[in-house]
Interface confidence: low
C-alpha cells in the first residue's frame, strides 16, 4: 500500500504550507495539548489548501480565519506495519494567543503514549504547524477516524479526519459457544468474523473434519441435527488476507446427575432432622430440584418411605414431623431435566427425645387456713417412652383480686406428686395449672383449677379434679 | 536505577539556563520524567513532565518560563529567562510509568542561583 | 491546574504516637496522589502512590488513605528517624491537571 513504512514528508498533505527558504530547518516539540506555540513572526496571507474550520466556540470577526489543511483522507494498511500521517495549519502572525495540537479518534483526545511530534515552521509572516502522528506496528482496534484540534483565540479549530482502515485476518466477534444438548435433539451454533478485507467465509468443523464443503459466507449458523455423544467443534474465518480458526467448544449430552454425597446431620430435635449433602455431577444440566427420603429404622418389616421435596440449592433440608427419640435412615436423589441421579448412600440419624404430650391429671387444690397456703395434688401423666424421662413439673398460678393481678410459676422435682404453695392474695381467686417437664422440654398445662380465697377464714373452693383419660400408652 | 542533576550554577537575571538529567538503570522510552523545584526553606514546587514518548506537560506557572527536552538518557529543564525567584534547588525524578506523574525516585538535585 | 491543600504546617508527637495529615484538592483526582518525606538537605523519598500503596522499602507505620478530594497519611508508633517534612502531591491526568504538590507538613518527633 503507497502510504506504508512512507517518509513523513511524503506524506504531508498537499504542499508544504506556504513559501520555507531552501535552508530553513523547521524546530520541533513533542505534542502536548497544552504546549505554547512559539510566537508568530510577520503577517502573510492564508493559503487556499485549507479544510472549512468546524468553530466550536464563538470566532472573532476581526481577524481572517484560519482553518486546518486537508488531510490524506484515508489509509489503508495491513496489521502490524507503521503508519505515519499528518494535519497542518498556517497561523498568520495576527493571532496572538495559540495552544498547542491535539489529536483525536474517534471523538476521544489521544493522551499519554501516542508518538505525535508537532514541527514550526516560522517565516516573517507567521509560522506554518505541522502535526505529525505514527502508529507502529497497528493493531485493529488502531481502525477509526483521526483528527486534530487546535485553539486559535479561543477558537477551537478541527481538521477534516484522517481513516485508517486496518486490514488483517479475520477477526471473530462471536465465535461458537460450549452447549450442553439432549441426545439426538437438534441445535444451533453460531460463528462471526469480520474483515476488513471482506468478505469472511466460515467453514464448520467437527472433531477435526470438515463439516461444510463450500463456506458459508459470515455470519453463519450451523444447525446439527443431533449427537449421541460429546463432540468438539470451531469454525474457519478465511478472507484474502489469510485464515483465523475459533476456538474449539465441546458440546456435551445431557445425562441423569450423579447421586449426591457427603450426606450429614447438622441438628437434631425431638421432631426434626437438619440434613446436609454435596451435590454430585450435574450431568451437563443444572439441578432442578431434590428429594429426601426418610424411613424408619428400628422397623423389622420394610416400613413406608416419607419423601421430601425440595429446592436444589441450598443443599439443606429440615425434615420435620418425625417421632421423638426415634432412628431413622436418610439417603437423597437430585433430579436434572433428564431425570433423577440414583439415591445417595444411606446414612442413619436420631431424634432427641420430646416433651410430654399429655398434662399432669386429677389436679385438687385445698387451702390450708392455719398455715396459709395451697396444698396441690396431682396425678402423674402418662409419659411415652419417647416423651424422655420426667424430671419435674411447673405450676403456674395466677391471683386476681379487685385491683390486684399476680402470675407466678414454681418448678417441683419428679418426686411426689403434690407441692405447697403460700396464699399471696386474700379476698381473690387462685387459678392452678401443671405440666409435666422432660429432659425434652415441658408439656401442655393442665386444664384451670379455681379456688377462692376468702378474706377472712371462710373457705369457698371447688376441688375440681381433671379427669383421668384412658392411657394411650400402647 | 539513579538519576542526576548537573548544570546548576549562578546566572544573571534573563540568562537561559540548562538544567540536565542523567539517568541509568531504566529506559526514558518506558518511564516519564519530572521537574520539581525547591526554594531555599520553601516547599515542593511541580515545574513539569515529560512522559515516555516525548510529550511535555507544564505546571500552569511554568508554561513559557520552562522548556524540557530529553534524549535517549538525559533530560533537559531549560529556564528561558531567570529571574531571582527562579533561586532553588532543581530535581529531577523518574516518573512511575510512562504517563504517571509520581515520582520514585529522585535526584540529589542541583542548585541554581540568580543573581545580579 | 488542581491545588493541594496540606493541614497542618506542623505537628509534634512524641515517640510512639500516632501523627495524622490531611491533603485537600481542589477537585477530585481519583486516587492518583502520592506522599513524600523530606529531610532537611537531602532528595524526597515516595513514601505512597495512588492514594494508599506504599512504595517499595517502605515501612508499614505509614499508612495512606481517601479518595476524590479528602486525603490522609498516618504515621504510627513515631520513631525519631521519622522527623521529617511529608508532602502530597497530584498526579491526576498530569497533562491537563498539572502535578502539584501541597505545602508541606513538618513533623517534629518529641
Known amino acids: 500500500e503507497k502510504w506504508e513504512e512512507t517518509e513523513l514528508d511524503q506524506l504531508f498533505s498537499g504542499p508544504l504550507p506556504g513559501r520555507l527558504p531552501v535552508n530553513h530547518r523547521p524546530f520541533s516539540a513533542p505534542h502536548s495539548s497544552r504546549d505554547q506555540l512559539p510566537p508568530p513572526q510577520t503577517g502573510r496571507s492564508h493559503p487556499a489548501h485549507t479544510a472549512a474550520p468546524q468553530v466550536t466556540s464563538t470566532a472573532s470577526k476581526l481577524l481572517p480565519p484560519v482553518a486546518f489543511n486537508h488531510t490524506i483522507g484515508h489509509i489503508v494498511l495491513s496489521e502490524h506495519k507503521n503508519v505515519k500521517f499528518n494535519c497542518s495549519i498556517n497561523i498568520p502572525n495576527t493571532y496572538q494567543e495559540t495552544a498547542g495540537i491535539s489529536w483525536w479518534k474517534d471523538g476521544k483526545e489521544l493522551l499519554g503514549a501516542h508518538h505525535s511530534i508537532t514541527q514550526f515552521y516560522p517565516d516573517e509572516e507567521g509560522v506554518s504547524i505541522i502535526a505529525l502522528f505514527s502508529i507502529a506496528s497497528v493493531q485493529r482496534s488502531d481502525n477509526g477516524s483521526y483528527f486534530c484540534k487546535m485553539k486559535v483565540n479561543n477558537r477551537e479549530i478541527v481538521s477534516d479526519p484522517i481513516y485508517v482502515e486496518v486490514q488483517g485476518l479475520p477477526y471473530f466477534i462471536k465465535q461458537p459457544e460450549s452447549v450442553n444438548v439432549t441426545r439426538n435433539t437438534a441445535f444451533n451454533l453460531t460463528c462471526q468474523a469480520v474483515g476488513p478485507p471482506e468478505p469472511v467465509n466460515i467453514f464448520w468443523v467437527q472433531n477435526s473434519s470438515r463439516v461444510n464443503e463450500k463456506p458459508e459466507r459470515s455470519p453463519s449458523v450451523l444447525t446439527v441435527p443431533g449427537l449421541t455423544e460429546t463432540a468438539v467443534f470451531s469454525c474457519e474465518a478465511h478472507n484474502d488476507k489469510g485464515l483465523t480458526v475459533s476456538k474449539g467448544v465441546h458440546i456435551n449430552i445431557k445425562v441423569i446427575p450423579s447421586p449426591p454425597t457427603e450426606v450429614h446431620i447438622l441438628n437434631s430435635t425431638a421432631h426434626s432432622i437438619l440434613v446436609s449433602w454435596v451435590p454430585g455431577f450435574d450431568g451437563y444440566s443444572p439441578l432442578q430440584n431434590c428429594s429426601i427420603q426418610v424411613k424408619e429404622a428400628d422397623r423389622l418389616s420394610n416400613g413406608s418411605v416419607m419423601v421430601f421435596n425440595t429446592s436444589a440449592s441450598p443443599h439443606l433440608y429440615e425434615i420435620q414431623q418425625l417421632q421423638a427419640l426415634a432412628n431413622y435412615s436418610i439417603a437423597v436423589s437430585c433430579r436434572n431435566e433428564i431425570g433423577w441421579s440414583a439415591v445417595s448412600p444411606w446414612i442413619l440419624a436420631s431424634t432427641t427425645e420430646g416433651a410430654p404430650s399429655v398434662a399432669p391429671l386429677n389436679i385438687t387444690v385445698f387451702l390450708n387456713e392455719s398455715n396459709n397456703i395451697l396444698d396441690i395434688r396431682w396425678t402423674k401423666p402418662p409419659i411415652k417412652r419417647q416423651d424422655g424421662e420426667l424430671v419435674g413439673y411447673r405450676i403456674s398460678h395466677v391471683w386476681e383480686s379487685a385491683g390486684t393481678y399476680k402470675e407466678l410459676s414454681e418448678e417441683v422435682s419428679q418426686n411426689g406428686s403434690w407441692a405447697q404453695i403460700p396464699v399471696q392474695i386474700h379476698n381473690a381467686t387462685c387459678t392452678v395449672r401443671i405440666a409435666a417437664i422432660t429432659k425434652g422440654g415441658i408439656g401442655p398445662f393442665s386444664e384451670p383449677v379455681n379456688i377462692i380465697i376468702p378474706e377472712h377464714s371462710k373457705v369457698d373452693y371447688a376441688p375440681s379434679s381433671t379427669p383421668a383419660p384412658g392411657n394411650t400408652d400402647s | 536505577q539513579s538519576v542526576e542533576e548537573s548544570g546548576g550554577r549562578l546566572v544573571t537575571p534573563g540568562t537561559p539556563l540548562t538544567v540536565t538529567c542523567t539517568v541509568s538503570?531504566?529506559?526514558?522510552?518506558?518511564?516519564?520524567m519530572g521537574w520539581v523545584r525547591q526554594a531555599p526553606g520553601k516547599g515542593l514546587e511541580y515545574i513539569g513532565f515529560?512522559?515516555?514518548?516525548?510529550n511535555t506537560y507544564y505546571a500552569s506557572w511554568a508554561k513559557g518560563r520552562f522548556t524540557i527536552s530529553k534524549t535517549s538518557t538525559t533530560v533537559d529543564l531549560k529556564i528561558t529567562s531567570p529571574t531571582t525567584e527562579d533561586t532553588a534547588t532543581y530535581f529531577c525524578?523518574?516518573?512511575?510509568?510512562?504517563?504517571?506523574?509520581?515520582?520514585?525516585?529522585w535526584g540529589p538535585g542541583t542548585l541554581v542561583t540568580v543573581s545580579l | 491546574d488542581v491545588v493541594m491543600t496540606q493541614t497542618p504546617a506542623s505537628v509534634e508527637a512524641a515517640v510512639g504516637g500516632t501523627v495524622t495529615i490531611k491533603c485537600q484538592a481542589s477537585?477530585?483526582?481519583?486516587?492518583?496522589l502520592a506522599w513524600y518525606q523530606q529531610k532537611p538537605g537531602q532528595r524526597p523519598k515516595l513514601l505512597i502512590y495512588?492514594?494508599?500503596n506504599l512504595a517499595s522499602g517502605v515501612p508499614s507505620r505509614f499508612a495512606g488513605s481517601g479518595s476524590g478530594t479528602q486525603f490522609t497519611l498516618t504515621i504510627s508508633d513515631l520513631e525519631c528517624a521519622d522527623a521529617a517534612t511529608y508532602y502530597c502531591?497530584?498526579?491526576?491526568?498530569?497533562?491537563?491537571?498539572?502535578?502539584?504538590f501541597g505545602g508541606g507538613t513538618e513533623v517534629v518527633v518529641k
Open positions: 525524578a523518574k516518573g512511575g510509568g510512562g504517563d504517571w506523574g509520581y515520582f520514585n525516585i
Open positions: 538503570g531504566f529506559s526514558l522510552s518506558v518511564y516519564g
Open positions: 502531591q497530584t498526579y491526576y491526568a498530569i497533562n491537563r491537571y498539572g502535578g502539584a
Open positions: 495512588a492514594a494508599s
Open positions: 477537585q477530585s483526582i481519583g486516587n492518583a
Open positions: 515529560i512522559n515516555n514518548v516525548g
